[in-house]
């Protein structure tokens, strides 16, 4: 009966050699794709000269296959029932799933100019930067290929800095041949309700980016959860992409290739201001851009990005306050396309389908000393791109799952 099933499940979801969970955990059997939409700026001159609203037009999808590499340095620790690993990064362009090539050009914010002017507030330094920006013929906006924008290019302005700085800039630079971690997660041997829950990340239980509870590394990495998931649960997970832990709540029952799954979504409350959701007070790290912590829907992750003014949001500023999107024209947020969801098979806790959506934005501020930013009259949180990372269990695996798990229960 049910007890036997439970016993089998408990055995099979443990993260150790020989289990179904371990095999799929080390190297995902699901094909994972990351689609990018780039926000092409239509009126760079007007913005720079008159501080006009930024008119953007999204172009995409440009699709890459990701998460195809097996976890590395997988090491079991029998003493504390954990398994540690590195998650290697890799991305392969998929032309057939894309609207163009990696050589397509886009007009985007000049990442180096925006970042340098934010990091170096000292007015004397800004004068030096201004000389170098002018000398390199850099401006507030730049034209870059998709490949350059995502994976890196040598910046002409930074190349003039007669000091050892990283001159290569890219939203995901460096990516290929790098790895995320080390993660150390519970293998579930002693307590199945802790399986896949992260014990430490990069050797620590905290991130050192946030104050108080915001800094905690909570839950799993969202690829799976402890078994026997209830609809009433709040599923916590950590995402290194957004430098924080977050949570999902049950939304609806979904039938995925004949497998009953629970759809969990990231609620708007998770992106709310501390005024609406007091728990979020520690994600508000400064008072000016956040308008005294009343703005919502954008997360300042600069502390996690070496001081670069990176803001994470949902695509098209979904669930964000009107003041955030007001200076940007051309955005059309909608839940169906732009929210994040996880389809979880409740018995095993495995995520069988997911869509992780996020938007990368950069803050650019007026600067008296930097000519190309001198005419700005306001701060802009400029959308650069949004991404949709998806994975769905394959038909073969779904058949296996139905016969071995859900079929047995029904």
């Amino acid at each position: 009966g049910d007890l036997l099933i439970q016993k089998t499940i408990k055995k099979q979801v443990v993260l150790e050699e020989g289990t179904i969970a371990f095999k799929n955990w080390v190297k995902t059997g699901t094909e994972v794709y990351r689609q990018f939409w780039i926000f092409d700026v239509q009126n760079p001159q007007e913005v720079m000269m008159n501080s006009s609203n930024i008119q953007v037009k999204q172009r995409g999808p440009y699709t890459y296959r990701v998460r195809f590499l097996a976890k590395e340095n997988v090491t079991q620790d029998a003493e504390d029932n954990t398994v540690s690993f590195l998650q290697p990064n890799g991305a392969i362009f998929e032309p057939s799933l894309s609207v163009g090539t990696e050589a397509d050009n886009f007009t985007v914010l000049n990442l180096a100019v925006a970042a340098a002017s934010h990091i170096y507030q000292n007015q004397f330094v800004q004068m030096i930067l201004n000389s170098l920006i002018n000398k390199s013929k850099s401006s507030m906006f730049q034209v870059r290929t998709l490949r350059e924008l995502l994976w890196g290019y040598r910046d002409p302005f930074l190349s003039l800095v007669p000091y050892p700085v990283t001159t290569t800039v890219g939203l995901f630079y460096p990516y290929n041949n790098t790895a995320d971690g080390v993660y150390k997660v519970f293998n579930g041997k002693d307590n199945i309700s802790k399986v896949a829950i992260i014990d430490t990340y990069k050797g620590k239980r905290n991130l050192s980016y946030w104050e108080s509870h915001c800094d905690m590394i909570n839950g799993t990495d969202a690829a799976s959860f402890p078994p026997f998931v209830e609809k009433s649960q709040v599923l916590q997970f950590f995402s290194s992409d957004i430098c924080r832990s977050i949570y999902a709540v049950f939304e609806s029952d979904v039938n995925l290739k004949g497998i009953p799954v629970y759809r969990f979504v990231l609620p708007s409350k998770a992106f709310a201001s501390p005024v609406e959701n007091p728990d979020n007070y520690c994600f508000c790290t400064e008072k000016i851009i956040s308008k005294n912590c009343t703005s919502y829907g954008v997360l300042d992750i600069s502390k996690c990005k070496e001081g670069r003014p990176v803001y994470i949001s949902l695509p098209h500023f979904l669930y964000a306050s009107p003041d955030v999107s007001e200076p940007i024209d051309g955005l059309n947020p909608n839940e169906e396309e732009h929210r994040t969801y996880l389809d979880i098979e409740p018995i095993t806790g495995f995520t069988l389908q997911f869509a992780k959506r996020l938007q990368v934005n950069l803050l650019v501020k007026p600067s008296e000393k930097i000519q190309v930013l001198k005419n700005l009259k306001r701060n802009y949180i400029v959308p650069i791109l949004w991404l949709n990372e998806t994975g769905t269990i394959g038909d073969e695996k779904a058949n296996m799952f139905r016969s071995q798990v859900t079929g047995k229960i029904n």
Partner: antibody
Framework: QVQLQQSGAELVMPGASVKMSCKAS????????MHWVKQRPGQGLEWIGS????????TYSQKFKGKATLTVDESSSTAYMELARLTSEDSAIYYC?????????????WGQGTLVTVSA | ETTVTQSPASLSVATGEKVTIRCITS??????MNWYQQKPGEPPKLLIS???TLRPGVPSRFSSSGYGTDFVFTIENTLSEDVADYYC?????????FGAGTKLELK
């Protein structure tokens, strides 16, 4: 209070080099840039260059590139300027100056100056 | 490079009179002009910084105005202690450049 104590007057031969010092006190040395300014007798002021005392990043006026070299010694909170290949044109008072970085305030605190005389 | 043209080179006034010194820049520098006073044997002293801001402890008889390329420094009711050289400094762009100076004397 902020004090910048500069080394004494120098009489040097043409073609030689000279290295003067500027010892800072009354504030955290590495929190502020140090600027250097030249004043020829009875004449105006010229900005020579500046050094970020926290990481020794330097920037020079084009006119003084190759002439002046700015350095710091964090341990003694001292900034130095070396002038090379001296000529009579280099006879002047040299000031080290500290700004107030975030206020857009330039050359707020001055040393008393070091007089350099180039003569055979 | 922004050139700063300061005038007059010298002027002589009686105590209590008003003094006006002008600096014109070769490029638009917004309001990034600073004014210094230098007495004989002393280093220059900052009187007014960017944005026509009077520095703490500087008497209110000193003032400045201007924006863009044309700047004026004024001393109302000149005192004998105001005898000195006065310099303007543009701090909008690199290299920082000074005016040639104005020598103020008493009649």
């Amino acid at each position: 209070q902020v004090q910048l104590q500069q080394s004494g007057a120098e009489l040097v031969m043409p073609g030689a080099s000279v290295k003067m010092s500027c010892k800072a006190s009354g504030y955290t040395f590495t929190d502020y840039w140090m600027h250097w300014v030249k004043q020829r007798p009875g004449q105006g002021l010229e900005w020579i260059g500046s050094i970020d005392t926290s990481d020794s990043y330097t920037t020079y006026s084009q006119k003084f590139k190759g002439k002046a070299t700015l350095t710091v010694d964090e341990s003694s909170s001292t900034a130095y300027m070396e002038l090379a290949r001296l000529t009579s044109e280099d006879s002047a008072i040299y000031y080290c100056v500290r700004g107030e970085d975030y206020e857009g305030t330039w050359f707020a605190y001055w040393g008393q100056g070091t007089l350099v005389t180039v003569s055979a | 490079e922004t050139t700063v043209t300061q005038s007059p080179a010298s002027l002589s006034v009686a105590t209590g009179e008003k003094v006006t010194i002008r600096c014109i820049t070769s490029t638009d520098i917004d309001d990034d002009m600073n004014w210094y006073q230098q007495k004989p044997g002393e280093p220059p002293k900052l009187l007014i910084s960017e944005g026509n801001t009077l520095r703490p402890g500087v008497p209110s008889r000193f003032s400045s105005s201007g924006y863009g390329t044309d700047f004026v420094f004024t001393i109302e009711n000149t005192l004998s202690e105001d005898v000195a050289d006065y310099y303007c400094l543009q701090s909008d762009n690199m290299p920082l450049t000074f005016g040639a100076g104005t020598k103020l004397e008493l009649k």
